[in-house]
């Protein structure tokens, strides 16, 4: 097995992930592993020399960079919060704070905004990934209601009066629950006509 540095006439290396072509010497050299950087470039007689990234810096991939990337914080003012710290091999992992979605993306989320409220009679469609997009409000399905303006409230099933030994006084809608009454209670005058069938 050939180990770097080795000559390459066609400008390609056997292991593209862990080696790179150095055009000045027309050789293939080792890349540095994640968490390290190039402290001395390769030559015909000596392979790449790597060194560990200093504190508060990282390199995520096999590389031939002469510096490490600076760790960046998750800025709360931009709606972000940290979920995992920066290491020598991985940048700080950020997400949107609760009740927010990513509103600006440049390789990673840079700015979050508050999720829109869903009006009464609707709920936010459940997403595969939290924080990925703004709310898409969908109507409550039959037999369910939601009576607030909220980014997170879920549609609830209408109360079944009979389960509580009561009778229905007014049917539920998408925005309101069923109204129940005692079977012995007299009906209000305006409703008595509709109930005497």
């Amino acid at each position: 097995q050939v180990v770097p540095p080795y000559g390459s006439e066609n400008q390609t290396c056997r292991d593209q992930e862990k080696e790179y072509y150095e055009p000045r010497h027309r050789i293939c050299c080792s890349r540095c592993p994640p968490g390290t950087y190039v402290s001395a470039k390769c030559s015909r007689s000596r392979d790449t020399v790597c060194a560990t990234c200093a504190e508060n810096s990282y390199n995520e991939h096999w590389n031939y960079l002469t510096i490490c990337q600076l760790c960046r914080p998750c800025d709360p003012v931009m709606g972000l919060e940290e979920i995992a710290p920066c290491t020598s091999k991985r940048k700080t992992q950020c997400r949107c704070q609760p009740g927010m979605f990513c509103a600006a993306w440049a390789l990673e989320c840079t700015h979050c905004e508050l999720l829109s409220d869903c009006p009464p009679g609707t709920e936010a469609e459940l997403k595969d990934e939290v924080g990925k997009g703004n709310n898409h409000c969908v109507p409550c399905k039959a037999g369910h209601f939601q009576n607030t303006s909220s980014p997170s409230a879920r549609c609830q099933p209408h109360t079944r009066c009979e389960d509580q030994g009561l009778v229905e006084a007014a049917p539920g809608t998408a925005q309101s629950d069923t109204t129940c009454r005692n079977p012995s209670e007299s009906l209000p005058p305006e409703m008595s006509g509709t109930m005497l069938m």
């Epitope: 972000l80 919060e81 979920i83």
Partner: nanobody
Framework: DVQLVESGGGLVQPGGSLRLSCKAS????????FGWYRQAPGKQRELVAT???????WYDVSVKGRFTISRDNAKNTVYLQMNSLRPEDTAVYYC??????WGQGTLVTVSS
């Protein structure tokens, strides 16, 4: 918008300690991450410490090991415990969060 009131600054000798407080109103406190920022004379405002909703903390390398950020959700308050203070820590300190109004800040002066 979120209102923030910082307090606890003052004049302290090098090596001394201070505890800054930040009282927040106008938001669901437990749903917000917070940061402490500072601005030294003639310099840009910089982020020095953050705390997430879950209590995860981040510190700038210049304060790591000396400063501690914490939160008390019951009191709607974020704290910054500052130990082993140095003259270069002299600045106006602010706390802030999403849609927070920048307050007056609290001045920390480290001098002998």
């Amino acid at each position: 918008d979120v209102q923030l009131v910082e307090s606890g600054g003052g004049l302290v000798q090098p090596g001394g300690s201070l505890r800054l407080s930040c009282k927040a109103s106008g938001t669901t406190f437990s749903d917000r991450a917070f940061g402490w920022y500072r601005q030294a004379p003639g310099k840009q405002r910089e982020l020095v410490a953050t705390i997430s909703t879950a209590g995860l903390t981040w510190y700038d390398v210049s304060v790591k090991g000396r400063f501690t950020i914490s939160r008390d959700n019951a009191k709607n308050t974020v704290y910054l415990q500052m130990n082993s203070l140095r003259p270069e820590d002299t600045a106006v300190y602010y706390c802030n969060t999403f849609r927070g109004n920048w307050g007056q800040g609290t001045l920390v002066t480290v001098s002998s």
